[in-house]
Amino acid sequence: EPPTACREKQYLINSQCCSLCQPGQKLVSDCTEFTETECLPCGESEFLDTWNRETHCHQHKYCDPNLGLRVQQKGTSETDTICTCEEGWHCTSEACESCVLHRSCSPGFGVKQIATGVSDTICEPCPVGFFSNVSSAFEKCHPWTSCETKDLVVQQAGTNKTDVVCGPQDRLR
């Protein structure tokens, strides 16, 4: 009686179970009553990452430098190429099909989390007592200078964009 289901790594064709091709290989011909499944290795720049019955291998992803991409991990016959972004850029999606420049944190904001190849810069406002006077993709908010520890007095209070201005003691009103 012909089978209705096959074991793992097999497929049903013409009322019989044939072996699937292993990762890195494509199907050339199905098995018969007398012959095994015929498989062939994928060519250069091709891959198949599962046990399969595909007649064509997939092309490796191309990391287009014009889109800011570079190869993070070269593909094999069993794995696709993994792209990432050039330094200072990050992927626009999980598939990393293109890149955008890392965001800079404006004055008054500091970097909470530095960008990676897959995530943008996260900025946070500088709270009272801290400042950032630059637009930067890596600078955190800096604490205001303590004039007292320098034996000076505050001439002008700091803001979220400027440090305290210290001056000599005799400036005290």
Epitope: C126, G129, K140, V154, A157, N160
Partner: antibody, heavy 122, light 113 residues
Framework: QVQLVQSGAEVKKPGSSVKVSCKAS????????IEWIRQAPGQGLEWMGS????????NYAQKFQGRVTITADTSTSTAYMELSSLRSEDTAVYYC???????????????WGQGTLVTVSS | DIQMTQSPSSVSASVGDRVTITCRAS????????????LAWYQQKPGKAPKLLIY???SLQSGVPSRFSGSGSGTDFTLTISSLQPEDFATYYC?????????FGQGTKVEIK
């Protein structure tokens, strides 16, 4: 101990100005911030502005910008809040409070004056 | 400006009850550099000036009874009175001090049931 003593109640006519004082003692007045907060009858707390007496640096809430002036006299450890162009909606209790002490790590208001009632009425 | 929203606006409770007041900020009050939440809680009784209870969201001000506690981080904060005492019937305010202008919640009145 830290103390903030405010001037007495005032009754003012609409269009006039009021100047409330806040005399500080028991801490270094010049480096600490003095904050001004008001509370209209039956209402919540509303921050108006602040001053660091030693530097004369001030911050004002947008709502009061141009109508409030906060000053301080370090020789008498007294801060002042002047509100001009008074209207009936300015009827409130005005409080001074101590903010940061110059350490930049304690911006909350740990000591308050007793409050000054300002009544604006024609 | 950072908006502070308190709830409920009033609560009726009995002596011995556990009372919880919440406060929500329109933006995070947690600063990553020092891992501090820039939030304070105050108590105000009729005709009196407000009194500081809690600062940095969870630090108890000196002299404040331990039945008061503060918790929360980022945008959501809670003031808890574990066992309400007769002297705790008052209005409670949250306030942020992250950046100017400082703003207060609208207040929560704790009334006798």
């Amino acid at each position: 101990q830290v103390q903030l003593v405010q001037s007495g109640a005032e009754v003012k006519k609409p269009g006039s100005s009021v100047k409330v004082s806040c005399k500080a003692s028991g801490y270094t007045f010049s480096t600490s911030w003095i904050e001004w907060i008001r509370q209209a009858p039956g209402q919540g707390l509303e921050w108006m502005g602040s001053i660091q007496p030693g530097s004369g640096s001030t911050n004002y809430a947008q709502k009061f910008q141009g109508r409030v002036t906060i000053t301080a006299d370090t020789s008498t450890s007294t801060a002042y809040m002047e509100l001009s162009s008074l209207r009936s909606e300015d009827t409130a209790v005005y409080y001074c409070a101590r903010g940061d002490d110059g350490s930049y790590v304690r911006w909350y208001f740990d000591h308050w004056g007793q409050g000054t009632l300002v009544t604006v009425s024609s | 400006d950072i908006q502070m929203t308190q709830s409920p606006s009033s609560v009726s409770a009995s002596v011995g009850d556990r009372v919880t007041i919440t406060c929500r900020a329109s933006q995070s009050l947690l600063f990553s550099v020092n891992q501090k939440n820039y939030l304070a809680w105050y108590q105000q009784k009729p005709g009196k000036a407000p009194k500081l209870l809690i600062y940095w969201a969870s630090s108890l001000q000196s002299g404040v009874p331990s039945r008061f506690s503060g918790s929360g981080s980022g945008t959501d904060f809670t003031l808890t009175i574990s066992s309400l005492q007769p002297e705790d019937f008052a209005t409670y305010y949250c306030q942020h001090y992250y950046s100017y202008p400082w703003t207060f919640g609208q207040g929560t009145k704790v009334e006798i049931k």
